[in-house]
Amino acid sequence: ATKLTEEKYELKEGQTLDVKCDYTLEKFASSQKAWQIIRDGEMPKTLACTERPSKNSHPVQVGRIILEDYHDHGLLRVRMVNLQVEDSGLYQCVIYQPPKEPHMLFDRIRLVVTKGFSGTPGSNENSTQNVYKIPPTTTKALCPLYTSPRTVTQAPPKSTADVSTPDSEINLTNVTDIIRVPVFN
């Protein structure tokens, strides 16, 4: 069975979060997708979304967030550039399918942004996340206002017993670490 999990990214201010959410392309290729932040006990808040219908490989930028939907591959790419400490939080990708409730994609992203010198954007050789060159022409898409109460989350488990770190061979640098935390089975 598919498990809903969190993947934890620890980055420094000024770096870029660069993640992907996969979806069933036969079902959702042209559906509108969104990037949301989930605050404990609150409704998820949509920060950016693709156009409707979603266009293939067409970057959409909303502030420091860039979404790119690769229809042919069933992948939504999400970049958050020039990260700030206040960007820390739990994020998720969803697919809008009105009149039905949004469909949540795996995995959730637990982003932790810390202060720390990371040089000028793109200059930090230790970073395993790259700073994205913002495309000259991007579209700002209008996002539906509703979000499903079902996607309200509980706080993730406090215990570290469920936390499994990546294999030792991976050698993620000390700038970027990823920890997978099962939320429920």
Epitope: T5, E7, V19, D22, H73, R79, S164, E169
Partner: antibody, heavy 123, light 107 residues
């Protein structure tokens, strides 16, 4: 340690299908995407596509879209790549590969490779 | 699709030589570039990721640099075990593509 062990060499006739398996060990199978890369004899590397073993979702390049199916059996930590309507130009070594980062990372660095499976298509 | 052009396609060198291979992308790919080594009959091996980061266990004589469209892979002092084929690969977007390879032979 991370290991990807692939099934043995296959000889197929044009028009037939082949299913290559890739058994993973040494890590949590559902945490990392499996990709497939092929290499015709004496030629370069060609990326075919990816599969997320957790969600079961997959994607492939246009060239293979109508002919390739990527699946998995999480109970035995095994990924499969099936290529149908084989032609002579599909003769190649097929590799399954695990990425460096978790499945949510947009980081397509091919860190762990299977030993390869030679598929020969000949009448 | 982004085209990756490696040069030279082959080169001959001696043990102890400094060797440089270049890879040019058909458009800006930032630092989304990896380098691999492949020996005959073996699977490729990741050497460098994100243009300049050395993969764990890879000797420090291997290095990578560059960003945008032009990238360089260098072996500072060739060892006998370095004779192989080297490939660059981008992942700035989908689909992922590889360079055609550079075959490094003993002079």
């Amino acid at each position: 340690q991370v290991q990807l062990v692939q099934s043995g060499a296959e000889v197929k006739k044009p028009g037939a299908s082949v299913k290559v398996s890739c058994k993973a060990s040494g890590y949590t199978f559902t945490s990392y995407d499996i990709n497939w890369v092929r290499q015709a004899t004496g030629q370069g590397l060609e990326w075919m596509g990816w599969m997320n073993p957790n969600s079961g979702n997959s994607g492939s390049v246009k060239k293979f879209r109508d002919r390739v199916t990527m699946t998995r059996d999480t109970s035995i930590s095994t990924a499969y790549m099936e290529l149908s309507s084989l032609r002579s130009e599909d003769t190649a070594v097929y590799y399954c590969v695990r990425l460096i980062g978790y499945s949510s990372a947009f980081k397509w660095s091919f860190q762990h490779w299977g030993q390869g499976t030679l598929v020969t298509v000949s009448s | 699709d982004i085209q990756m052009t490696q040069s030279p396609s082959s080169l001959s060198a001696s043990v102890g030589d400094r060797v440089t291979i270049t890879c040019q992308a058909s458009r800006d790919i930032s630092k989304y570039l990896n380098w691999y080594q492949q020996k005959p009959g073996k699977a490729p091996k990741l050497l460098i990721y994100d243009a300049s980061n050395l993969e764990t266990g890879v000797p420090s004589r291997f290095s990578g640099s560059g960003s945008g469209t032009d990238f360089t892979f260098t072996i500072s002092s060739l060892q006998p075990e370095d004779f192989a084929t080297y490939y660059c690969q981008h992942y700035d977007n989908i689909p992922i593509t590889f360079g055609q390879g550079t075959r490094l032979e003993i002079k």
